[in-house]
């Protein structure tokens, strides 16, 4: 039994490392945003025993603009985005709350970006696709970048290639 993709959270990203039952994953507030105190970025794949259907718990995460970054200018395009490490204490406690808000995700106010793809109109950088990989590590820690850029990458090819050593999870997206 596996979970479907977790829900989207405004101004946050998540890299799902496993869709397996009881997997725990963590949302990361976008650059220029920080976690609101008292909210939790954690989600867990759990089983609804009544329906025998797996689902992700709903995170209470709220990503709010970092007031300290409001008056800063965005970094120019084509710069190197460098990430420093900022510890973020977390736990899936009964209350679902974390001890304190995280430090800002970055010193840049940019939150959403778009990419121009040949043969298409301006489109958001987030789009559905397929395939998944089972991995073994679920422990993670939040890092923060010192710069970000005005453009980003987006996977647009439709072909799928999987070399030896990749472990399919068995989950398939429904779009």
């Amino acid at each position: 039994i596996t979970c479907p993709p977790p829900m989207s959270v405004e101004h946050a990203d998540i890299w799902v490392k496993s869709y397996s039952l009881y997997s725990r994953e963590r949302y990361i507030c976008n650059s220029g945003f920080k976690r609101k105190a008292g909210t939790s970025s954690l989600t867990e794949c759990v089983l609804n025993k009544a329906t025998n259907v797996a689902h992700w718990t709903t995170p209470s995460l709220k990503c709010i603009r970092d007031p300290a970054l409001v008056h800063q200018r965005p970094a120019p395009p084509s710069t190197v985005t460098t990430a420093g490490v900022t510890p973020q204490p977390e736990s899936l406690s009964p209350s679902g709350k974390e001890p304190a808000a995280s430090s800002p995700s970055s010193n840049n106010t940019a939150a959403t970006t778009a990419a121009i793809v040949p043969g298409s109109q301006l489109m958001p950088s987030k789009s559905p696709s397929t395939g998944t990989t089972e991995i073994s590590s679920h422990e993670s820690s939040h890092g923060t970048p010192s710069q970000t850029t005005a453009k980003n990458w987006e996977l647009t090819a439709s072909a799928s290639h999987q070399p030896p050593g990749v472990y399919p999870q068995g989950h398939s997206d429904t779009t």
Partner: nanobody
């Protein structure tokens, strides 16, 4: 076809540093999130770090404070700076062109590079 090429691996002594590079190319190729993974013989591929389009990052607990992920969009390149290397960091390191299932929700795709070997030994 999406192609990923990793480089920068090698033999290093414990406590040393390496910087890995992952260059992406292909028709209309751009990535909203890029992850680094590593694998040792007989073990499952293990997630190491990710960098999202906004520039925010996340790390596995085993590498936090020692590894730094960054990206240069002008060069379609993602880097993994590895400091204070330990023998247990020995592995083949792969980058992955992540895909998006819901807005802001990403995971590993089936696009992998050939990997680059990192060996930490005295």
């Amino acid at each position: 076809e999406v192609q990923l090429v990793e480089s920068g691996g090698g033999l290093v002594q414990p406590g040393g540093s390496l910087r890995l590079s992952c260059v992406g190319s292909g028709d209309g190729f751009s990535i909203s999130a890029v992850g680094w993974y590593r694998q040792t013989p007989g073990k499952q591929r293990e997630w190491v770090a990710v960098i999202f389009a906004s520039g925010s990052t996340d790390y596995a607990g085993s590498v936090k404070g020692r590894f730094t992920i960054s990206r240069d969009n002008a060069k379609n390149t993602v880097y993994l700076q590895m400091n204070s290397l330990k023998p247990e960091d020995t592995a083949v390191y792969y980058c992955n062109a992540g895909v998006t299932t819901n807005p802001g929700v990403h995971r590993a795709s089936s696009y992998w590079g050939q990997g680059t070997q990192v060996t930490v030994s005295s």
